[in-house]
C-alpha cells in the first residue's frame, strides 16, 4: 500500500523519505527488499539510513531497487517501500520524462516554481536555476529561498526548469538537480476531445526480463491551460493503486507540456525488474477531459 517512487542521477546525492510517517523519535529500520539485508546507519557508508531518511551520497545506477522501511512506534510497526531508480547522466540537454517532477502552472500574478524535494536536503542559498539547460540571467528571475519567481510572465516562459543545489553532509558536498515543467496559463485557450500521442493503439513494446522499463502515456487536449485534463495508466482495466504490485508504479503528478501551442499531459508507468507475468497484462493509457475518454492499449513482449 505504501510505495513511493524516487529517482535521481548517478553521482548526485539522493535522499528518500520513508513513505510511512512517524515522530522523529521513532526508530526507522531500512532494508534492501530483495535480500532483507539491513542498511547501515553509519555515515561512513555511501548508502546509509538516518531515521526516516535513506541517503545515497552519491547515488549509483546499481542502487536502483526497492527499499523497505519499518517505523517502530510504541504500538505497531508500520512498513513502507521506496522504489528507487538511479539513471545515468544524460549526455545532451534533453531531460527525459522519467526525470521530471510534477508540472506547475503560473500566471502574471503568480509565477513561483518550487525546487522539488529540496526540503529533504541540507542546502544553503542561493539555488541555481536553468531553463532548458541555460542558466537564467536577468532581473526578471529571482531565486528566493527554495523557489524561483519570474516577473511579468509571458507564454514563452513555459518550459523545463532545473534547480541545482549543493547538499552538505558532514563537510562533504554533493550536487543535486531536479527538473519540472512550468506552464503559463493562457486565457485564449480551447478544449477538445483528447488525442493520445503515445502509445499507438495496440502497440507492442519489447522488454528484457529483469530489466526496468518505462511506458509513457501522452495526450493533448486543446490549447492553453485545461480545466480538466488527465492521463493515467490502467492494468487489465484496474487503477494502478488497486493493483498491489510495488514494482509497478505510476509517477506522482503529471508533466504538462505545450506542443505546437497544444496542452499535452504525460504520465510515466515505471516497471521495475520486469517479470514474465508482466507480459500477460494489458496496459491501457487513458486520456480524459470534459469532452470524453480515449483509450490506447499497449502490451509487452519479450525481446528476442
Amino acid at each position: 500500500k505504501f510505495s513511493k517512487q524516487s529517482w535521481g542521477l548517478e553521482n548526485e546525492a539522493l535522499i528518500v523519505r520513508c513513505p510511512r510517517q512517524g515522530k522523529s523519535s521513532y526508530i526507522v529500520d531500512w532494508y534492501y527488499s530483495q535480500t532483507n539485508k539491513s542498511i547501515p546507519t553509519q555515515e561512513r557508508n555511501r548508502v546509509f539510513a538516518s531515521g526516516q531518511l535513506l541517503k545515497f551520497l552519491p547515488a549509483e545506477v546499481a542502487d536502483s531497487g526497492i527499499y523497505t522501511c519499518i517505523v517502530r512506534s510504541p504500538t505497531f510497526n508500520r512498513t513502507g517501500y521506496a522504489n528507487v531508480t538511479i539513471y545515468k547522466k544524460q549526455p545532451d540537454c534533453n531531460v527525459p520524462d522519467y526525470l521530471m517532477y510534477s508540472t506547475v502552472s503560473g500566471s502574471e500574478k503568480n509565477s513561483k516554481i518550487y525546487c522539488p524535494t529540496i526540503d529533504l536536503y541540507n542546502w544553503t542559498a542561493p539555488l541555481e536555476w536553468f531553463k532548458n539547460c541555460q542558466a537564467l540571467q536577468g532581473s526578471r528571475y529571482k531565486a528566493h529561498k527554495s523557489f524561483l519567481v519570474i516577473d511579468n510572465v509571458m507564454t514563452d516562459d513555459a518550459g523545463d526548469y532545473t534547480c541545482k543545489f549543493i547538499h552538505n553532509e558532514n563537510g562533504a558536498n554533493y550536487s543535486v538537480t531536479a527538473t519540472r515543467s512550468f506552464t503559463v496559463k493562457d486565457e485564449q485557450g480551447f478544449s477538445r476531445f483528447p488525442v493520445i500521442r503515445a502509445p499507438a493503439h495496440n502497440e507492442t513494446k519489447e522488454v528484457e526480463i529483469g530489466e526496468n522499463t518505462n511506458l509513457t502515456c501522452s495526450a493533448c487536449f486543446g490549447k492553453g491551460a485545461q480545466f480538466l485534463a488527465t492521463v493515467q495508466w490502467q492494468l487489465n482495466g484496474n487503477k494502478i493503486t488497486d493493483f498491489s504490485e510495488p514494482r509497478i508504479q505510476q509517477e506522482e503528478g503529471q508533466n504538462q507540456s505545450f506542443s505546437n501551442g497544444l496542452a499535452c499531459v504525460n504520465t510515466v508507468l515505471r516497471i521495475a525488474d520486469v517479470k514474465e507475468e508482466d507480459l500477460l497484462l494489458r496496459y491501457d493509457c487513458l486520456a480524459l477531459n470534459l469532452h470524453g475518454l480515449r483509450r490506447h492499449t499497449i502490451r509487452l513482449s519479450r525481446k528476442n
Epitope: 500500500k1 510511512r20 510517517q21 512517524g22 515522530k23 519499518i70 512506534s73 510504541p74 504500538t75 505497531f76 510497526n77 508500520r78 512498513t79
Partner: antibody, heavy 121, light 107 residues
C-alpha cells in the same frame, strides 16, 4: 474472503464465568494482532486489548487489565475473551477486530459481527 | 491515556451537503489516526487510516486530513447511505483510544 466470526449472544448471571470466541479465516491468523472492543448500550467504542496469536503476546488497556483474559488457540485460528466473574456492568456488545501484522498496520481493518453479552440477575 | 475529543457529537445535513467532523488529540499523535463508520446494529468499518489514506473499496467522497493533534474527516457530498456514527481512533500509544463519536443524520 478475510473474515472474523464471533460466537453467539450470551445471557449470564453476576458472578458467573464466560468465554466468547472469534474465529479468523481467509488470512494468516498467526501473523496478525487480534483485539477486542467493547460497546456498552447506546455508548461509544472502547478498546480493551490485543493478542498476537503467533507468540501469545498481549497488551491491555489499564481499564480492563485484570478484569478480563485474552487468549488464542492458533491451531483452530480462534481468539478468546473471558471473564472469571461477570458483573452487571459487563453488559455490552463485544467486537473482535484485526489489528495488522508484526511488521505492518493499517488500522482495525477487519471486524467480527459482535457478541452481545447480557449480565443480569 | 491519550484523550480523543470529537465534535460535533451529532449533526443533521441534507443529501449532497459537505459534512465535516473534527477530532482533537490530547497530545501529538503524528498521523496515527483512523476513522470508522458504524451503521445502526452493525460492526464498525474502517474508512480512513493514517489520517488521510482511503481504505480499499471506500467511496472517494470520504476523506481525511491533519497531523499532530488536529484532524478532520469530510464527506464531500452526503448520501442517504452515509447515515451512521463516525469515530476517530488513535494508535500512536497504548491504550488505543476512540473519540466519542459523531452521529450523522439526514435532514
Amino acid at each position: 474472503e478475510v473474515q472474523l466470526v464471533q460466537s453467539g449472544a450470551e445471557v449470564k448471571k453476576p458472578g458467573e464465568s464466560l468465554k466468547i470466541s472469534c474465529k479468523g479465516s481467509g488470512y494468516s491468523f498467526t501473523n496478525y494482532w487480534i483485539g477486542w472492543v467493547r460497546q456498552m448500550p447506546g455508548k461509544g467504542l472502547e478498546w480493551m486489548g490485543i493478542i498476537y496469536p503467533g507468540n501469545s503476546d498481549t497488551r491491555f488497556s489499564p481499564s480492563f487489565q485484570g478484569q478480563v483474559t485474552i487468549s488464542a488457540d492458533k491451531s483452530i485460528t480462534t481468539a478468546y475473551l473471558q471473564w472469571s466473574s461477570l458483573k452487571a456492568s459487563d453488559t455490552a456488545m463485544y467486537y473482535c477486530a484485526r489489528h495488522g501484522t508484526s511488521s505492518d498496520y493499517y488500522g482495525l481493518d477487519v471486524w467480527g459481527q459482535g457478541t452481545t453479552v447480557t449480565v443480569s440477575s | 491515556d491519550i484523550q480523543m475529543t470529537q465534535s460535533p457529537s451529532s449533526l443533521s445535513a441534507s443529501v449532497g451537503d459537505r459534512v465535516t467532523i473534527t477530532c482533537q488529540a490530547s497530545q501529538d499523535i503524528s498521523n496515527y489516526l483512523n476513522w470508522y463508520q458504524q451503521k445502526p446494529g452493525k460492526a464498525p468499518k474502517l474508512l480512513i487510516y493514517d489520517a488521510s489514506n482511503l481504505e480499499t473499496g471506500v467511496p472517494s467522497r470520504f476523506s481525511g486530513s491533519g497531523s499532530g493533534t488536529d484532524f478532520t474527516f469530510t464527506i464531500s457530498s452526503l448520501q442517504p447511505e452515509d447515515i451512521a456514527t463516525y469515530y476517530c481512533q488513535q494508535d500512536d500509544n497504548f491504550p488505543l483510544t476512540f473519540g466519542g463519536g459523531t452521529k450523522v443524520e439526514i435532514k
